[in-house]
C-alpha cells in the first residue's frame, strides 16, 4: 500500500504523458487521478513506465473499479495486463474479440500464463461456445490451445469452427480429444470431394473409427506413415492386409520400419502370415498358416 501524500505543487497530472516516467511511485499515487487514467489508458503503452510504476497505476484502477474493470479500460490495458492476477480477470466481462486480441498480443511469444488462460476461459464462457473467429484467434496466438482443452470443453466447439484448425494445432492432442474432434471435422468437410476431403480430414484421423478407415481405403488416398501411426490401435486392428495396402498406397513399404511400434506391431499380430507375405516387405509376427483365429470377444458376446 502506497502512503497517501499530497501532490507537490505543479505536479498534478492534467493528462497521461511521458513526464510521468520521472515521477516517483508516491508522486504517481498522489498526482494522477484514477478517472483521468481510465479515460487515457490508450496512452499508457507508449510510455516506458517501470513495473513498479505500473503497480501504482494498477492500484489506482483497482480503487476506481473494485467490481472489475469495464471493457473500455480492459481493451487498452496493454502491458498493464501482465500485472493482473487471475482473480482480477475473473471479475471482468470481456465480450469483444478485439479486446481479446489486444491482450493476447501483450503476451505474444510467451507461454500461456494463468492470466491468459483465465482471460480465454472468461471470454469463451461469455460467448457460450468456441466460435470460428475465436478459435482462429486463439490458435493463431497459441497453436496448442485446442489440445489444452478437455474432451468436455471440446464438445462445445461447433463443426463450423473446425475450418479454422490447422494441422499443427492438433500436434499435442491425445486420442480422447481427437475422438471428440473427428466427428465434427467429418461433418464440417462432408461436402468436399475425395482428395480435398482427405487433405482436410487427415489431421483428425486419430479419432477415426474402423469403418471410416475402410471407406478411405477405397479412395486411393495414399495415407503417409506419420498419419497411419497416429491412428487409434483399436481402429487399425480389424483392417485387412489388402485394406491397409490400399490405404497407404506407395507408402506401404514404410510398414517395415515401423513393425515394432504400435499400431503396426499390434496389427501384424492380428494378420495371417501368408497375407503379410503378399506385401513382400518381410513383415514377421503374423498368425502362422493353419492356425485357427478365435475372436473371443465375439464368443463372450454370444454367451
Amino acid at each position: 500500500e502506497v502512503e497517501k501524500t499530497a501532490c507537490p505543487s505543479g505536479k498534478k497530472a492534467r493528462e497521461i504523458d511521458e513526464s510521468l516516467i520521472f515521477y516517483k511511485k508516491w508522486e504517481l499515487e498522489a498526482c494522477v487521478d484514477a478517472a483521468l487514467l481510465a479515460t487515457q489508458m490508450d496512452r499508457v503503452n507508449a510510455i516506458p513506465f517501470t513495473y513498479e510504476q505500473l503497480d501504482v497505476l494498477k492500484h489506482k484502477l483497482d480503487e476506481l473499479y473494485p467490481q472489475g474493470y469495464p471493457e473500455s479500460v480492459i481493451q487498452h490495458l496493454g502491458y498493464l495486463f501482465l500485472k493482473m492476477s487471475p482473480e482480477d480477470i475473473r471479475k471482468w466481462n470481456v465480450t469483444s474479440l478485439e479486446t481479446l486480441k489486444a491482450l493476447l498480443e501483450v503476451n505474444k511469444g510467451h507461454e500461456m500464463s494463468p492470466q491468459v488462460a483465465t482471460l480465454i476461459d472468461r471470454f469463451v464462457k461469455g460467448r457460450g461456445q468456441l466460435d470460428k473467429d475465436t478459435l482462429d484467434t486463439l490458435t493463431a496466438f497459441y497453436p496448442g490451445y485446442l489440445c489444452s482443452l478437455s474432451p468436455e470443453e471440446l464438445s462445445s466447439v461447433p463443426p463450423s469452427s473446425i475450418w479454422a484448425v490447422r494441422p499443427q494445432d492438433l500436434d499435442t492432442c491425445d486420442p480422447r480429444q481427437l475422438d471428440v474432434l473427428y466427428p465434427k471435422a467429418r461433418l464440417a468437410f462432408q461436402n468436399m470431394n475425395g482428395s480435398e476431403y482427405f487433405v482436410k480430414i487427415q489431421s483428425f484421423l486419430g479419432g477415426a473409427p474402423t469403418e471410416d478407415l475402410k471407406a478411405l481405403s477405397q479412395q486411393n488416398v495414399s495415407m503417409d506413415l506419420a498419419t497411419f501411426m497416429k491412428l487409434r490401435t483399436d481402429a487399425v486392428l480389424p483392417l485387412t492386409v489388402a485394406e491397409v495396402q490400399k490405404l497407404l498406397g506407395p507408402h506401404v513399404e514404410g510398414l517395415k520400419a515401423e513393425e515394432r511400434h504400435r499400431p503396426v506391431r499390434d496389427w501384424i499380430l492380428r494378420q495371417r502370415q501368408d497375407d503379410l507375405d503378399t506385401l513382400g516387405l518381410g513383415l514377421q509376427g503374423g498368425i502362422p498358416n493353419g492356425y485357427l483365429v478365435l475372436d473371443l470377444s465375439m464368443q463372450e458376446a454370444l454367451s
Epitope: 511521458e18 513526464s19 516516467i21 520521472f22 503503452n45 507508449a46 516506458p48 517501470t50 496493454g78 498480443e105
Partner: antibody, heavy 115, light 111 residues
Framework: QVQLVQSGAEVKKPGSSVKVSCKAS????????FSWVRQAPGQGLEWMGG????????NYAQKFQGRVTITADESTSTAYMELSSLRSEDTAVYYC????????WGQGTLVTVSS | DIALTQPASVSGSPGQSITISCTGT?????????VSWYQQHPGKAPKLMIY???KRPSGVSNRFSGSKSGNTASLTISGLQAEDEADYYC???????????FGGGTKLTVL
Amino acid sequence: QVQLVQSGAEVKKPGSSVKVSCKASGGTFSSYYFSWVRQAPGQGLEWMGGIIPKFGSANYAQKFQGRVTITADESTSTAYMELSSLRSEDTAVYYCARRTSMDYWGQGTLVTVSS
Amino acid sequence: DIALTQPASVSGSPGQSITISCTGTSSDVGGYNYVSWYQQHPGKAPKLMIYSVSKRPSGVSNRFSGSKSGNTASLTISGLQAEDEADYYCGAWAHMSLGKVFGGGTKLTVL
C-alpha cells in the same frame, strides 16, 4: 503536422562549445520527452540525453555527463543542446527527437570540430 | 557505447522476407516492451518504423513487423522492395539509466 527544425551547421575549434537548437511545431511541447542523439560519420546512433520541458530537469547518458547541457524554452517551444570541451571525435550530425519512442526527428545539424 | 547487438548487414532479393535481430539484456529489451526500430537512408534523419515492440506508426507499410522473444527483438520486412535498402537501428528504453540505448545498426541490401 509535427515538425522539428534544427539550427544550421557549425564549425568549431577544439576546446570550444556548441549550442544547437530544435524548434517544435504542430503539437504540444511541454509534456513530451525530447532527446538528443548524435551520429559520427559512418557510425551508428548515440543517445546523449533528454528533457521534459515542463519540468526543466534533463537526464544524460553517462558518457556525456558534465559535458552536455540540455535545456528547453516553453515560450518558444524550443529545445537546446550545448556540448562543451569539444574534441575532433565530437564531429557528428546532432539530431533532436520527440518522445521516448522518437516518433519525429529534426533534420540534423552537422557540427565539425577542427583546428 | 553500443548496448544492443545487431548483425552488421543482411541482404535479400526483391519480394523476399528478411529478419534483423536485436539482442539486449533483461533490463532493456527483455524486461520491457519498449523496443523501437528506425530506418535511415543515406544523408537523411532516422524514421520510426516500429515502436513498443510491434506497433506501426500510421503511414508505415504493413510489410514491416516487429516481435520479441526473451532478450531478442526482431524486425521483419516482407515483400522486399528496392526502397527498403537502408540502415536499420533498434532502440530500447533502459530503465536503469532512464535513457535510450541503440544497436550498432544493420545495413540492408536489396539484391
